[in-house]
Interface confidence: medium
């Protein structure tokens, strides 16, 4: 199974050293899915040329990604702690349809990917605790992802490569944002 | 179109003292923090200190702590840093920076002024 | 406030591929941003949160970073990328930045 941080024993703690705080936790999780995306980047682009198309040509897509604007309070200007949590806990979990897509896209990468899926989850764990008292979280229908989910799969394999790389460039885009966001709170 | 004005730097003695104002346009100074940034000739770029938005958070190198503060005023659009107590070594070009959309925690500079002259000589 | 390490200069022939290396500080734990700066100049930011490009920075400057240690890529360096590069971060705290003490491209042919 994929090592999440915290479990690989060189993250144990040093005697005498400090464990980790909780926002530590979180930041050094993201920064491990993170590493992770990038993995799954370079197979992406190795076997397709679509890391090459401009990001003009990519925006015109179907997929209603998770995207950060300005209303979402995460960013420096009209920054709302609360309002910002709620909007990566729903993203995250908005993006939880996508990354069981990405389970069957990967040959070399394959553990990888699961790491990826499986450390948000305990991510969006994290951060549901932390938004114990927000009740403003929306999860997405089941009904709703199983179908997109079909639909995805059911894409030729130009589209599919390309809904890969989505993805991956948005997953990671707002996991950026987040960690930075995060790192006020 | 963002711009910083850096003014105030000029020849000073050891000891003494000098007010530097970076002056903002272009953007929403009230909404992002703002830092200073030195470069001593021939060497590299080196942070100074650094301001939140609201002007209630303030940090600083070790190397300036207790002589240098800054602080901003923005009614004005203007960011300031009054050096106390000056050393040879703070001999640089002062650039004032604006820190990206980022967050006060994880600082990147996307507008930098041209720069201000200060050099400390007896 | 720990220091970042760059190579101090860096050559490179006319179109070929130049990367520039920064490590050390709390690179593992927090972005790295890079900045290029010409003679006389304010720096310009090139790469920001690790390999984001702003907008208005050619498509031959891109970012990495991996176990501490982030990377400036310029591939296809022409004569107008010669200069001082330099990466920054900030350290653990997150209360203060750190530079890299920079690097020298210089761009041959």
């Known amino acids: 199974a994929p090592v999440l941080p915290g479990e690989d024993s060189k993250d144990v703690a040093a005697p005498h050293s400090q464990p980790l705080t909780s926002s530590e936790r979180i930041d050094k999780h993201i920064r491990y899915i993170l590493d992770g995306i990038s993995a799954l980047r370079k197979e992406t682009c190795n076997r397709s040329n679509m890391c090459e198309s401009s990001k003009e040509a990519l925006a015109e897509n179907n997929l209603n990604l998770p995207k950060m604007a300005e209303k979402d309070g995460c960013f420096q200007s009209g920054f709302n702690e609360d309002t910002c949590l709620v909007k990566i806990i729903t993203g995250l979990l908005e993006f939880e349809v996508y990354l069981e897509y990405l389970q069957n896209r990967f040959e070399s990468s394959e553990e990888q990917a699961r790491a990826v899926q499986m450390s948000t989850k305990v991510l969006i764990q994290f951060l549901q605790k932390k938004a114990k008292n927000l009740d403003a979280i929306t999860t997405p229908e089941p009904t709703t992802n199983a179908s997109l989910l079909t639909k995805l799969q059911a894409q030729n394999q130009w589209l599919q490569d390309m809904t890969t790389h989505l993805i991956l460039r948005s997953f990671k885009e707002f996991l950026q944002s987040s960690l930075r966001a995060l790192r006020q709170m | 179109e963002v711009q910083l004005v850096e003014s105030g730097g000029g020849l000073v003695q050891p000891g003494g003292s000098l007010r530097l104002s970076c002056a903002a346009s272009g953007f929403t100074f009230s909404s992002y923090a703002m830092s200073w940034v030195r470069q001593a000739p021939g060497k590299g770029l080196e942070w100074v200190s650094a301001i939140n938005s609201g002007g209630g958070s303030t940090s600083y190198a070790d190397s300036v702590k207790g002589r240098f503060t800054i602080s901003r005023d923005n009614a004005k659009n203007t960011l300031y840093l009054q050096m106390n107590s000056l050393k040879p070594e703070d001999t640089a070009v002062y650039y004032c920076?604006?820190?990206?959309?980022?967050?006060?925690?994880?600082?990147?500079?996307?507008?930098w002024g041209q720069g201000t002259q200060v050099t400390v000589s007896s | 406030q720990s220091a970042l390490t760059q190579p101090s200069a860096l050559s490179v022939t006319l179109g070929q591929t130049a990367k520039i290396t920064c490590q050390g500080g709390?690179?593992?734990?927090?972005?790295a941003h890079w900045y290029q700066q010409k003679p006389g100049q304010a720096p310009v930011l090139v790469i920001y949160d690790d390999d984001s490009r702003p907008s208005g920075i050619p498509e031959r400057f891109s970012g990495s970073s991996s176990g501490g240690r982030a990377t400036l890529t310029i591939s296809g360096a022409q004569a107008e990328d010669e200069g001082d590069y330099y990466c920054q971060s900030a350290d653990s705290s997150g209360n203060a930045s750190v530079f890299g003490g920079g690097t020298h491209l210089t761009v041959l042919g």
């Open positions: 920076a604006k820190e990206g959309d980022t967050g006060w925690k994880d600082p990147m500079y996307d507008y």
């Open positions: 709390s690179l593992g734990t927090r972005y």
